[in-house]
């Protein structure tokens, strides 16, 4: 006899990285017929939704209209069908960004390199932080973590055309409070004579897209929660 229901999916829209004072929606998708959804924040009950009619709804949305450091942290959700509760969802790490200062991102030997060359990114921030994060824009969130008093190194090693793309970095004041993003650095790797454009699985976005930190496309989020659960979120574990 089944004692619990399958765990729901949890994700954030437009993204788990939320600029301070901006709105974010935490989505929890369970099963049709669920009479109650609970959102937990840092282990305590945060919000409850009892959708009506339950048989026509399998996803609820919990809005946070004004993101701040108090609201940053780990969220999970559960749902209930009759008296039977689900397993808890995976943890969603909600990060507040645009805190305090802006780091500087540079690349050595330069932004235009030949395939096979060794490339290192440097992220510098003079305020009190010792953890830095390098993110590559694209369909999935490629994130690296680095440490240093005011600067962290991110060696990419010998690069290939797959490394082409736009990079930004953050300083991290704690796991859930990050700085403003650096200005972007576009890495161009030559060596693929046939095709010098970006790889199709790693598209660039319009310049304003970064404003909402859509490192993963919304359609991608909605279609593949497993991808969402296991990309950039893993860096916070």
């Amino acid at each position: 006899q089944q004692q619990t229901l399958p765990k729901p999916f949890i994700w954030a829209e437009p993204h788990f990285m939320v600029p301070k004072e901006k709105q974010v929606t935490i989505c929890c998708q369970g099963n049709y017929g669920a009479v109650e959804y609970q959102l937990h924040f840092e282990g305590s009950l945060f919000a409850v939704d009892r959708p009506k009619p339950p048989e026509r709804i399998n996803k609820v949305q919990f809005y946070i209209p004004d993101m701040n450091s108090r609201m940053a942290g780990q969220y999970s959700c559960i749902y209930r069908v009759g008296e039977l509760w689900s397993e808890p969802s995976n943890l969603l790490d909600l990060v507040v960004t645009e805190m305090y200062d802006t780091p500087t991102l540079s690349v050595h030997p330069g932004p235009e390199v030949i395939s096979g060359e060794k490339v290192t990114f440097y992220c510098r921030l003079d305020t009190a932080t010792s953890m830095f994060l390098l993110l590559k824009e694209g369909r999935s969130s490629h994130v690296q973590r680095g440490y240093g008093k005011v600067q962290a190194e991110f060696p990419l090693g010998p690069v290939t055309t797959a490394h082409r793309g736009t990079y930004r970095c953050f300083g991290s004041y704690n796991n859930h409070a990050w700085s403003f993003p650096s200005e972007p650095v576009k890495l161009l790797v030559t060596g693929d004579i046939e095709n010098t454009s970006l790889a199709p699985e790693d598209p660039t976005f319009p310049a304003d897209t970064w404003g909402t930190y859509l490192l993963t496309t919304e359609t991608g989020l909605q279609k593949d929660h497993a991808l969402w659960d296991h990309t950039a979120q893993n860096l916070l574990r």
Epitope: Q23, F62, D66
Partner: nanobody
Framework: EVQLVESGGGLVQPGGSLRLSCAAS????????MAWVRQAPGKGLEWVSA????????YYADSMKGRFTISRDNSKNTLYLQMNSLRAEDTAVYYC???????????????????????WGQGTLVTVSS
């Protein structure tokens, strides 16, 4: 912007009743989930009860279940808390609170954590004593 003003507090004997009111100004009141939160002397904030913007969903802290009733009248922009069977440990300043007003909230959602609330009244003191 939402302004909240509580009233109805006072001195009551154990076992007695009180009805708190919270008058709201601002056009968005009828679309905001709300709550009552209290703070006992020398203690931290304690969430009491919450209600969805439609009034159709309510939620109570365990120690208030069966004794307190939260309700709202959106036509009057007013939130209420009916408190029965009051105990000495219910002595506190009671605050009404509303979530931020820039989101399309579900008609059935309630927020059960004080950190979710952006707007707060100045509070009304309830003293339960013989």
């Amino acid at each position: 912007e939402v302004q909240l003003v509580e009233s109805g507090g006072g001195l009551v004997q154990p076992g007695g009743s009180l009805r708190l009111s919270c008058a709201a100004s601002g056009r968005t009141f009828s679309r905001l989930p709300m709550a009552w939160v209290r703070q006992a002397p020398g203690k931290g904030l304690e969430w009491v009860s919450a209600i969805s913007w439609s009034g159709g969903s309510t939620y109570y802290a365990d120690s208030m279940k069966g004794r307190f009733t939260i309700s709202r009248d959106n036509s009057k922009n007013t939130l209420y808390l009916q408190m029965n069977s009051l105990r000495a440990e219910d002595t506190a300043v009671y605050y009404c609170a509303a979530v931020g007003d820039s989101a399309p909230y579900s008609a059935t959602i309630v927020y059960t954590d004080a950190r979710a609330y952006a707007y707060w009244g100045q509070g009304t003191l309830v003293t339960v004593s013989s």
